[in-house]
């Protein structure tokens, strides 16, 4: 089976690496533009230079290309707690990240939100907080894990999953309730 190639990939594959086929004349291969630049005019003929121009402020190209426009620089999303790790340059997009003691939670492939790493109060750190993963906590006796926080077994309702972990405490609570009746 021959893999299906898009029109641009088909055109590029006719030319050697680092070149692309002229859109108006498929017998001409033009040199691609370096990263940090974009295609202003195709090369007029074989062996002649492609007219590449540097990206303007607020835009970039991160690899060799024959794009008619540079790509807009990403903005870090304040509402998601993101901070700028490095600013956009002509050949590299903005790099966004989180503050110290925070991790990234990806809601989708290209959208993340910063959250504070769990401190494991009433428990111990099983796995340390990482760039893209919260701390994994193990809770002390008398506590159970709920949404990555160690919660007292006194907050455990019988219908919840915590009943297995908090069984002795629940029995005690039940016992005190029973003994309280007159």
């Amino acid at each position: 089976l021959v893999p299906h190639l898009g029109d641009r990939e088909k055109r590029d594959s006719v030319c050697p690496q680092g070149k692309y086929i002229h859109p108006q004349n498929n017998s001409i291969c033009c040199t691609k533009c370096h990263k940090g630049t974009y295609l202003y005019n195709d090369c007029p003929g074989p062996g002649q230079d492609t007219d590449c121009r540097e990206c303007e402020s607020g835009s970039f190209t991160a690899s060799e290309n024959h794009l008619r426009h540079c790509l807009s620089c990403s903005k870090c999303r304040k509402e998601m707690g993101q901070v700028e790790i490095s600013s956009c340059t002509v050949d590299r997009d903005t790099v966004c990240g989180c503050r110290k003691n925070q991790y990234r939670h990806y809601w989708s492939e290209n959208l993340f939100q910063c959250f504070n790493c769990s401190l494991c109060l009433n428990g111990t750190v099983h796995l340390s907080c990482q760039e893209k993963q919260n701390t994994v906590c193990t809770c002390h006796a008398g506590f159970f894990l709920r949404e990555n926080e160690c919660v007292s077994c006194s907050n455990c309702k019988k219908s919840l999953e915590c009943t297995k972990l908090c069984l002795p405490q629940i029995e005690n609570v039940k016992g005190t309730e029973d003994s309280g009746t007159t």
Partner: nanobody, 119 residues
Framework: EVQLLESGGGLVQPGGSLRLSCAAS????????MVWVRQAPGKGLEWVSH????????YYADSVKGRFTISRDNSKNTLYLQMNSLRAEDTAVYYC????????????WGQGTLVTVSS
């Protein structure tokens, strides 16, 4: 008590439009970034769009970019989602929610409104 009430869903033909609304109460709406998420039949939650407190910064999933517009009216405590050029793959229950704060979970969200795109 926090309440979010979505409305505006329904049956629409491909290429059609709908405007979803989300009426908020029980919290200071103007202080909260808000989110639209959706759940297609048999699939997980998908983040559709969000908007900051004042309605300046917005985000759209690639699948809806250029077709959907999120907006808010803080004087009416209402969030909106204008959906144009609807496709069959937009069929889902749409929920509005407050942007999570403490961890990757929605602290409050509505009961949802069903959007069905079919000819």
């Amino acid at each position: 008590e926090v309440q979010l009430l979505e409305s505006g869903g329904g049956l629409v033909q491909p290429g059609g439009s709908l405007r979803l609304s989300c009426a908020a109460s029980g919290f200071t709406f103007a202080h909260e970034p808000m989110v639209w998420v959706r759940q297609a039949p048999g699939k997980g939650l998908e983040w559709v769009s969000h908007i900051d407190r004042v309605g300046q910064d917005t985000y759209y999933a690639d699948s809806v970019k250029g077709r959907f517009t999120i907006s808010r009216d803080n004087s009416k405590n209402t969030l909106y989602l204008q959906m144009n050029s609807l496709r069959a793959e937009d069929t889902a229950v749409y929920y509005c929610a407050g942007l999570p704060k403490r961890g990757p979970r929605f602290d409050y969200w509505g009961q949802g409104t069903l959007v069905t795109v079919s000819s």
